[in-house]
């Protein structure tokens, strides 16, 4: 066969679907690889072909579109399963071609099982809610295109294993789940089960997402440098190890980049001709506020190093701060035999 632009196996789109539920999978060519859509391709006389490789097999084979009740079908650039079976797991390829053009991409599809409490190996999307912020909503995800707008599905929401009804601050509102006010206790997995009819059959769509309650922007403050501070003096003798921690608290801020860095005499440590190492550790609170610690270390400090200015800097979307460490050279204790004896008039 003639050459085909092969985009390979698109592992970025690790598609997971539940067993015994409908699944609609769009050919990724039009979403991520080509600059035109399916309608344009179809109008230009290009044909979309689907095939697959079963799990643990090397052989590519055509997809059987003649199964009972059209269990697998194709509609425009969408591959439909009504419903999926466990052994549909494999790598699927969609190929767009005519006599002069060919482009294809493969993607993995995994059909997973769930238990009665919706536990499964499915990777769950995370939705962040602000703590004590006011009404916030989550929406049942990825259900568009499964049924026409004329069909009115029934939607049931669960937290973990429990159906959500008569919860204090969580109210199901169709496709939305409203949190009147979110608390840490609202952390957990929430599942919507969408039930709809189609051609005399009833289908279920199960969608689970993880809710994580995070710090509210209303309480967010600029970075706070806890260390270095005015109460601690780093007093060292030449040859000793100098260790200065820079500990910074960052309020949680959605999509904010938190940065901590040291300067020595106004320059980045890399630009100073001394042997400095910097080690960073990060910890998070329950609401994802962040504490970053960068420890500046000079193994064998010199008297020159002890005269330098060591400044810790921090930046977030709320502002930038800096604090200087107080570094001094330790004055050696007087040696009794010489200094003190002389002081007492000894001869």
């Amino acid at each position: 066969s003639e050459r085909c632009d092969d985009w390979g196996l698109d592992t970025m789109r690790q598609i997971q679907v539940f067993e015994d539920e409908p699944a609609r999978i769009k050919c990724p060519l039009f979403e991520h690889f080509l600059k035109f859509n399916y309608s344009t391709a179809h109008s230009a006389g290009l044909t979309l072909i689907w095939y697959w490789t079963r799990q643990d097999r090397d052989l590519e084979e055509p997809i059987n579109f003649r199964l009972p009740e059209n269990r697998i079908s194709k509609e425009k650039d969408v591959l439909w399963f009504r419903p999926t079976l466990l052994n549909d797991t494999g790598n699927y390829t969609c190929m767009l071609r005519n006599t002069t053009y060919c482009s294809k991409v493969a993607f993995p599809l995994e059909v997973v099982q769930k238990d009665s409490c919706f536990n499964s190996p499915m990777k769950l999307p995370v939705h962040k809610l602000y703590i004590e912020y006011g009404i916030q909503r989550i929406t049942c995800p990825n259900v568009d295109g499964y049924f026409p707008s004329s069909v009115k599905p029934t939607i049931t929401w669960y937290m973990g294993c429990y159906k959500i009804q008569n919860f204090n601050n969580v109210i199901p509102e169709g496709m939305n789940l409203s949190f009147l006010i979110a608390f840490i206790s609202n952390n957990g997995n929430y599942t919507c089960v969408v039930t709809y009819p189609e051609n005399g059959r009833t289908f279920h769509l199960t969608r689970t997402l993880t809710v994580k309650v995070v710090g509210s922007p209303k309480n967010a403050v600029p970075p706070v440098i806890h260390s270095p501070n005015d109460h601690v003096v780093y007093e060292k003798e030449p040859g000793e190890e100098l260790l200065i921690p820079c500990t910074v608290y960052f309020s949680f801020l959605m999509d904010s980049r938190n940065e901590v860095w040291w300067t020595i005499d106004g320059k980045k440590p890399d630009d100073i001709p001394i042997d400095v190492t910097i080690n960073e550790s990060i910890s998070h609170s329950r609401t994802e506020d962040e504490t970053r610690t960068q420890i500046l270390s000079i193994k064998k400090v010199t008297s020159e190093d002890l005269k330098r200015s060591y400044v810790c800097h921090a930046r977030s979307a709320k502002g930038e701060v800096a604090k200087a460490a107080t570094v001094k050279q330790k004055v050696p204790a007087p040696r009794y035999t010489v200094e003190l004896a002389c002081g007492f008039g000894a001869t």
Epitope: P217, V221, G319
Partner: antibody, heavy 118, light 112 residues
Framework: EVQLVQSGAEVKKPGESLKISCKGS????????IGWVRQMPGKGLEWMGI????????RYSPSFQGQVTISADKSVNTAYLQWISLKASDTAIYYC???????????WGQGTTVTVSS | DIVMTQSPLSLPVTPGEPASISCRSS???????????LDWYLQKPGQSPQLLIY???NRASGVPDRFSGSGSGTDFTLKISRVEAEDVGLYYC?????????FGQGTRVEIK
């Protein structure tokens, strides 16, 4: 440049209504509180209340609760301070300022002088 | 309400000399996240107030390093290491621990 621009000076009679404004620019208006502060002639600063323009969550000082209304229109990046019925004792300079959560009123408006006199 | 008490209320200073203003709150301003919700503001004659220090000890952007804030809990201090003529005005502390924020009465700093 981050700035808050307040509406101009007002001279009113007792019993009249008034709404003064504070327009933010150069930053995300819905990501900071806007606070209002009163300064009566020759006196210190008094905190009146704050609003979060993102959802209009408003908190008042007990001294000003029921006396004034704080509101915001995020579509025009503007906060407002309103009186239904002014009194002579409302004569003051009113400042708006942006703030992070519970701290740092780091940008202030130029102040609006309100004079209430019969 | 948290009550903020400043002292002194008037502070005559000599340029080049240090100066110190105290602020005491009626309850601790130490937040559970380890910072103190106390700010210092300066209002120069005829101007809007300006932020000097926030969260107890953090200098605001553009504030000269002769200004420093210290303290924790209920007792706080604003220090000016060497007073300059442009530092005259009214200094206020403000607490932001609760959503009812409150200012101190103000300290008037003037040149002797």
């Amino acid at each position: 440049e981050v700035q808050l621009v307040q509406s101009g000076a007002e001279v009113k009679k007792p019993g009249e209504s008034l709404k003064i404004s504070c327009k933010g620019s150069g930053y995300s208006f819905t990501s900071y509180w806007i606070g209002w502060v009163r300064q009566m002639p020759g006196k210190g600063l008094e905190w009146m209340g704050i609003i979060w323009p993102g959802d209009s969550d408003t908190r008042y000082s007990p001294s000003f609760q029921g006396q004034v209304t704080i509101s915001a229109d995020k579509s025009v990046n503007t906060a407002y301070l309103q009186w239904i019925s002014l009194k002579a004792s409302d004569t003051a300079i009113y400042y708006c300022a942006r703030s992070s959560g519970g701290t740092a009123m780091d940008v202030w408006g130029q102040g609006t002088t309100v004079t209430v006199s019969s | 309400d948290i009550v903020m008490t400043q002292s002194p209320l008037s502070l005559p200073v000599t340029p080049g000399e240090p100066a110190s203003i105290s602020c005491r709150s009626s309850q601790s301003l130490l937040h559970s996240n380890g910072y103190n919700t106390l700010d210092w503001y300066l209002q120069k004659p005829g101007q809007s107030p300006q932020l000097l220090i926030y969260l107890g000890s953090n200098r605001a952007s553009g504030v000269p390093d002769r200004f420093s804030g210290s303290g924790s809990g209920t007792d706080f201090t604003l220090k000016i290491s060497r007073v300059e003529a442009e530092d005259v005005g009214l200094y206020y502390c403000m607490q932001g621990l609760q959503t009812q924020w409150t200012f101190g009465q103000g300290t008037r700093v003037e040149i002797k």
